[in-house]
């Protein structure tokens, strides 16, 4: 970058180099060029050369202000005019940051996934810093008092093999950049309770053609945890609203949930469960689109990603089973 | 010996638009930055503009930004002054001067008087 | 812009006697201040640059000090030939400007 220059003086920043965004900051150069009393010492950001604001401190000093600076980062470097040479002589160079001070992480969550053998721990980080902000999660066992640090610049990882202090700890995020540090409120967990299981996976689906057709939704997950509460939640394409259908699920065969609805219309499903009775859901699973016949059987396997699912319309459908309306998003 | 000489001044009527020239000597004219200084009789001095070696930077009097402009001619060492829509109050002594190494204007010319009036 | 006030518009002295001129920035110039100065019927000859440096050919009699927004042109001395205009310049900061003006008399 700039900062790895040979300087023929020095460049310096007031307040400093990172500075919060919409500061008035002044650029200061000092030229020590041999031979050379500087006629004139020029200002370049981002290689443009400012024409304003530059005051002219003494024979070998120039001050640049900027009012409200707003740019996360800038290139600066100043030149002089040496008497008899044409070319500007480089001075220095620095590059420059504004942002902001972290805000407190809230949201603090931390979640086994089932088979990862990891605790992955996420928080909500706040607005915006637009400079290097890192993040280190403590955790501490409520019965060893051990704490273990972990930094990062996002989420983290956590092996469970590292988690040797029983199962019930405290969690806290603190956040720190150049500009400011704080600190996320304490997170208690028990590793029981924050489980979630296998993701479930629809499979297939297929209507038959009775007296009232009925669609039969095939899914499963690969959990061995026992005692597991599954949603449904389906509507037609076309449709904003979703309906629900809850389960109490047991995975040891493949999940068959019966469904009556309208004919040749295309219906998209997704499924989530958790462990029964704990806090945390899987994500929402990949959509499955299934178009109900006009009379004949079909039998689709369609489970894909799809970007545009939530477009934003409504429905009505009739299904038998436990149904509620839905307008939830993807929660944890 | 340093010389500036001025030239292009007059009686001019408001509105109407001058060039003045400045003519050096005594020095290599493209190792410096030049200027334009004018003065109103029994009064301050009041810097015009400025322009570097070889015409690729110039700076002005915010006022005076639209209506005036300064350039130089390097092969013939002639610095000149541009002014268009010239107005009473520009009515003054216009003074050529270079700008030495150390920026201070350290030789004048003997100036040019030019008069706006009706 | 930056004004510069040189707030005595006249100042009178005596041969040998020794009179300063004063010229105050609204803003911080540094040391980027020059002093001109300007004989009747002549134009301004160059004393002092830098605040403080006296130009090639010009009596030690003649001494600037200052810095930041306060200036002092300093003569000691009086000469019947000081008789003149006495200006400050700044060139800190585009545009570039000059004080008022201060004319010294003899008496």
């Known amino acids: 970058g700039i900062t790895n220059i040979n300087c023929s003086g020095h460049i310096w920043v007031e307040p400093a180099t990172i500075f919060k965004m919409g500061m008035n900051i002044s650029i200061y150069c000092q030229a020590a060029i041999k031979n050379c009393q500087p006629r004139k010492l020029h200002f370049y950001k981002n290689g443009i050369k400012e024409r304003f604001q530059i005051t002219r401190i003494n024979k070998t000093t120039a001050r640049l202000w900027y009012k409200n600076f707003l740019e996360p980062h800038a290139s600066m470097y100043c030149t002089a005019e040496c008497p008899k040479h044409f070319q500007e002589t480089l001075i220095c160079g620095k590059d420059i940051s504004s942002g902001y001070p972290p805000d407190i992480p809230d949201e603090v969550t931390c979640v086994i996934y089932e088979y990862s053998g990891n605790m992955t721990c996420t928080w909500n980080a706040g607005k915006l810093t637009y400079i290097d902000t890192k993040y280190v999660v403590h955790v501490k066992s409520l019965e060893t008092e051990e704490e273990q640090q972990y930094l990062t610049s996002s989420y983290i990882n956590i092996s469970t093999d590292s988690l040797q202090g029983g199962k019930k700890y405290l969690v806290w995020v603190q956040a720190a950049n150049a500009l400011g540090m704080e600190e996320s409120k304490q997170l208690q967990i028990h590793l029981d309770d924050i489980v979630i299981p296998s993701a479930a996976v629809i499979s297939r689906a297929e209507t038959i053609n009775a007296t009232v057709p009925k669609t039969i939704i095939y899914w499963d997950s690969q959990t061995t945890i026992e005692k597991v509460s599954c949603e449904m939640r389906y509507k037609a394409t076309t449709n904003q609203t979703w309906n629900v259908k809850e389960f109490d699920t047991n995975f040891t065969y493949v999940q068959q949930s019966e469904f009556y609805l309208e004919p040749n219309i295309k219906y998209v499903f997704q499924v989530r469960c958790q462990e029964t009775g704990k806090r945390y859901w899987q994500p929402w699973s990949s959509l499955f689109f299934h178009k109900t016949p006009e009379t004949v059987p079909q039998v689709t396997s369609k489970a894909f990603q799809h970007d545009t699912w939530n477009s934003g319309l409504t429905v009505a459908s009739i299904s038998t089973g436990h149904l509620t309306s839905d307008n939830r998003g993807d929660i944890g | 010996e340093v010389k500036l000489v001025e030239s292009g001044g007059g009686l001019v009527q408001p509105g109407s638009s001058m060039k003045l020239s400045c003519t050096a000597s005594?020095?290599?004219?493209?190792?410096?930055?030049m200027a334009w200084v004018r003065q109103v009789p029994e009064k301050g001095l009041e810097w015009v503009a400025n322009i570097n070696y070889d015409g690729s930077n110039t700076y002005y009097l915010d006022s005076l930004k639209s209506r005036f402009i300064i350039s130089r001619d390097n092969a013939k060492n002639i610095l000149y002054l541009q002014m268009s829509s010239l107005k009473s109050e520009d009515t003054a002594t216009y003074y050529c001067?270079?700008?030495?190494?150390?920026?201070?204007?350290?030789?004048w010319g003997q100036g040019t008087t030019l008069t706006v009036s009706s | 812009d930056i004004v510069l006030t040189q707030s005595h518009k006249f100042m009178s002295t005596s041969v040998g006697d020794r009179v300063s001129i004063t010229c105050k920035a609204s803003?911080?110039?540094?040391?980027?201040v020059a002093w001109y100065q300007q004989k009747p019927g002549q134009s301004p000859k160059l004393l002092i640059y830098w605040a403080s440096t006296r130009h090639t050919g010009v009596p030690d009699r003649f001494t600037g000090s200052g810095s930041g927004t306060d200036f002092t042109l300093t003569i000691s001395n009086v000469q019947s030939e000081d008789l003149a205009d006495y200006f400050c310049q700044q060139y800190s900061t585009y545009p570039y400007t000059v004080g008022g003006g201060t004319k010294l008399e003899i008496k």
């Open positions: 803003q911080d110039v540094g040391t980027a």
């Open positions: 005594g020095f290599t004219f493209s190792d410096y930055y």
């Open positions: 001067a270079r700008e030495g190494y150390d920026e201070a204007m350290d030789y």
